[in-house]
Structures are given as C-alpha cells and as structure tokens.
Amino acid sequence: MVPPPENVRMNSVNFKNILQWESPAFAKGNLTFTAQYLSYRIFQDKCMNTTLTECDFSSLSKYGDHTLRVRAEFADEHSDWVNITFCPVDDTIIGPPGMQVEVLADSLHMRFLAPKIENEYETWTMKNVYNSWTYNVQYWKNGTDEKFQITPQYDFEVLRNLEPWTTYCVQVRGFLPDRNKAGEWSEPVCEQTTHDETVPS
C-alpha cells in the first residue's frame, strides 16, 4: 500500500498558486506524484509522475472555487487522493506593496506600488483585482515602540511636520476593507528628516 502525500497545502501569494506537500516515508523506493484539478466535472492532470513535492496551479481562474488533488505513486501502485479546495480571490495572500520614500525637509513623501499579479506578462496588479483596495501605512520614530497608522486615500502620502534630524521608519501593506483582509507588511524603510524649513519672522 502506497501512503498518501502529507501536509498538503496551497501556498498562494499574489495569485501564484503552488500546491505543496511532503513525501511520506516509503521503504520500497522513491515515490512520484500526480496532481490534478477539477475542470467542469473532469479531473485534469497538471503535474504527472513528478518527483517534485509541489505543482504550479497559477493558471486557474482567480475567481473559481477549485478542487485540487494529489497522490503518491510507486510502480503500478498508488495512494488515495488527497483533496483540497481553494478559491484564489479569497485565499491568496496579498504580498507586500512596493514603496518609494523621499525626504523633503521635515516631511516624508511616499509613493506606493500595488503588488503585481504573479506570472502574467502585463502590469496587472492586485489593486486591479480588488475594487476596495487601499493601503495601510504605519510609521514610527526609529528606536521607539509607539507606532502610528494612517490610511492614505491615494497611491501617495506625505507625513508632514516631523521632528527635524530624526530617523523615521515607514512600512505599508494592502488592505481590503470589504473583506477585512490585510496583506503582508513591506520591509521598513527608514529615513532621516533634515531641517524645519519654516523661516523665523
């Protein structure tokens, strides 16, 4: 009897959908695997007789409820199928946005770039797919624990009237208010403000 794949899960970030699993212990030799997806009542092969422990399902519709399955094989024997269901638009992880930060005196000027949908040729982004897309920004004085959050209305934001000659750190994530779903935070970007430009009267 061939044991089934273990710890079968979908690792999906920005619609790059990778089904992953672990090979079970099997004394007779090396196992291969076949992964399939359900397409209108028929299971279609996606990865056949592969020695890998993952399979790319990124071509599946972003909007469908998909049934995927994988089994282990050895010679003419095979395990039972292990099934999972997956809806990309609901289940994919929203990766961190890009962010450009520029210091202008006592202000930080930030521009945000929505994460690109993986593996498509053109420049469609996660913002295209999700109508309610917005950004959360959090910032703090470097070396302190207190963090401040804002929700910019646009793809840019300016933090004004900051303390001069002080290093501030900023990070951004995508947020979907209608789903109450937050993406991953970007890596912090830390920049030092310069002087306060106000001129004494």
């Epitope: 071509s59 599946l60 972003k62 498509e120 040729y121 053109e122 469609w124 797919v129």
Partner: nanobody, 126 residues
Amino acid sequence: QVQLQESGGGSVQAGGSLRLSCAASGYTYSSYCMGWFRQAPGKEREGVAAIDSDGSTRYADSVKGRFTISKDNAKKILYLQMNSLKVEDTAMYYCAAEPYCSGGYKRTMVAEFGFWGQGTQVTVSS
C-alpha cells in the same frame, strides 16, 4: 462583476457558416483573456478557441482552419466566425472570460476562466 451574453447561434446546413458574438460588461475589457467553449449533449464542455489580452489565439485541433476567434476591444465584443460547419459541431456554445489576464498561461481549460455566459445553441444538419 463581469457579465457575458452570447448571440448568433441557430440552425444551418453542413458546410454553412455562422458568426457568434459575446457582449461583455464590467472590468477593463482589454484585460480579458477570453474563450469559446462548447458542450454537445452527453459530452463534457470543451475548449474551442481562446484569445489573450495581447491578441494571441489558440484553437482546438478539430476547428483549426475553419473557425476564427477575434475581439473588438472598443465595442467589448468577442466573435467566433465558424465556416465549413460539420454535423459534429452541433453543441451549446459558451463564451468565457478571465479578467486581468495576459498570455502567460495559454488558457484553454474550463477551470482557467472565471466568468461564463448562458450559451447559444448551434445546430448543424446534414
């Protein structure tokens, strides 16, 4: 939300022609990958032709040289020109769309398209 509405089906003699249309609304039309599928009674739904947002096309072997898929981005309409029709082309024809899609995956399978029309019947008699 994407809405798709097919038209242009009907009855025709073998060797004749039909042009199917699929009107789309919602999303940015130029971002769609689109396809025509068909389902004959008692058979599974199968891909007929597909067109990516960049205009590249693919056809099932059974219709190559006879069917032509095209789209008018300005009018938001997908077409399927069917010539030299055969009795075995008889089926319900469905239009499908996947928004925010380019040519990366050469989509041809039902599960690769998220939005579907209600279908239009094509009957070819001998």
